[in-house]
Amino acid sequence: TPEVWVQVRMEATELSSFTIRCGFLGSGSISLVTVSWGGPNGAGGTTLAVLHPERGIRQWAPARQARWETQSSISLILEGSGASSPCANTTFCCKFASFPEGSWEACGSLPPSSDPGLSAPPTPAPILRAD
């Protein structure tokens, strides 16, 4: 079965800056990726970015830049300042819509013991929902 992995990294240079990386481990064709924080999108989570493989990218503050890393993985840089900035225990979620598998979502947060600039290797996070 497909899996989604999520990796969260705090930048050493800017302690309020985060990089979120997400990937889809499946054979299907990805049609949309939605990144949110504070929980799954549409279930209390706040939209950070939506990436379509053909049509483009849309992002929401405090996202600075979302991009495709490969055909099945994305990254998102968050710029933290003020009320909308993330904190160390913030949960980030990535939802991949693919054909024919459907939608797969996983969430992750900064590893508790991670030093700035370090992060755990990208491993599959628990799958929260498969539509």
Epitope: T47, Q65, W68
Partner: antibody, heavy 114, light 113 residues
Framework: QVQLVQSGAEVKKPGASVKVSCKAS????????IEWVRQAPGQGLEWMGV????????NYAQKFQGRVTMTRDTSISTAYMELSRLRSDDTAVYYC???????WGQGTTVTVSS | EIVMTQSPPTLSLSPGERVTLSCRSS????????????LSWYQQKPGQAPRLLIY???TRETGIPARFSGSGSGTDFTLTISSLQPEDFAVYYC?????????FGGGTKLEIK
């Protein structure tokens, strides 16, 4: 079929606010974000911002920050764009669009004049 | 913000002719991770809303005639109409779909010679 129907033309005085509505039908409203684009008379297209109807999250072009508010009412599949502190150069046709700008409303003419 | 520059501003042509419209972005719109260019083209006729023609620099939107084609990569893009029909005389806009804010070009007006 997908349809976006916007509210009617408005005439406003400088300093006032205007709220334009965009009623969506033919698709699941919360599954596609709505973008707003305006066009001043004889000018080109200007991207104003985007709202995710599912969560209500909005992001605005820097130029409009502090003056524009995008909201939605999921119960009636309608998105709204409110622009405050209107100036004469806000006179334009305001469009809503969905599905990555594949579908557009008919446009709402907003005239700002004293 | 990304600046989208279209040229020429106006073009006078006759039906049946082939036309190439140009759009240049101030920053590359190529997504290196998946090798896609996030550039769209729109057509707008007087008194009407814009109509999406091309997305991803070269993919025709559903229902768009085959005479419309898009090409280019990085910062330089073109929209080609292989044989102009009377209904093609309109204003054409390109749009950056990669970087916030998602700016449009100033447009190219196609008028009948």
């Amino acid at each position: 079929q997908v349809q976006l129907v916007q509210s009617g033309a408005e005439v406003k005085k400088p300093g006032a606010s205007v709220k334009v509505s965009c009623k969506a039908s033919g698709y699941t409203f919360i599954n596609n974000f709505i973008e707003w684009v305006r066009q001043a008379p004889g000018q080109g297209l200007e991207w104003m911002g985007v709202i995710n109807p599912g969560s209500g999250d909005a992001n605005y072009a820097q130029k409009f920050q502090g003056r524009v508010t995008m909201t939605r009412d999921t119960s009636i599949s309608t998105a709204y764009m409110e622009l405050s502190r209107l100036r004469s150069d806000d006179t334009a046709v305001y469009y809503c669009a969905s599905h990555w700008l594949a579908y557009w409303g008919q446009g709402t003419t907003v005239t700002v004049s004293s | 913000e990304i600046v989208m520059t279209q040229s020429p501003p106006t073009l006078s042509l006759s039906p049946g002719e082939r036309v190439t419209l140009s759009c240049r972005s101030s920053q590359s719109l190529l997504s290196s991770g998946n090798q896609k260019n996030y550039l769209s083209w729109y057509q707008q006729k007087p008194g009407q809303a814009p109509r999406l023609l091309i997305y991803g620099a070269s993919t025709r939107e559903t229902g768009i005639p085959a005479r419309f084609s898009g090409s280019g990569s990085g910062t330089d893009f073109t929209l080609t109409i292989s044989s102009l029909q009377p209904e093609d005389f309109a204003v054409y806009y390109c749009q950056n779909g990669h970087f916030y804010p998602y700016t449009f070009g100033g447009g190219t007006k196609l008028e009948i010679k």
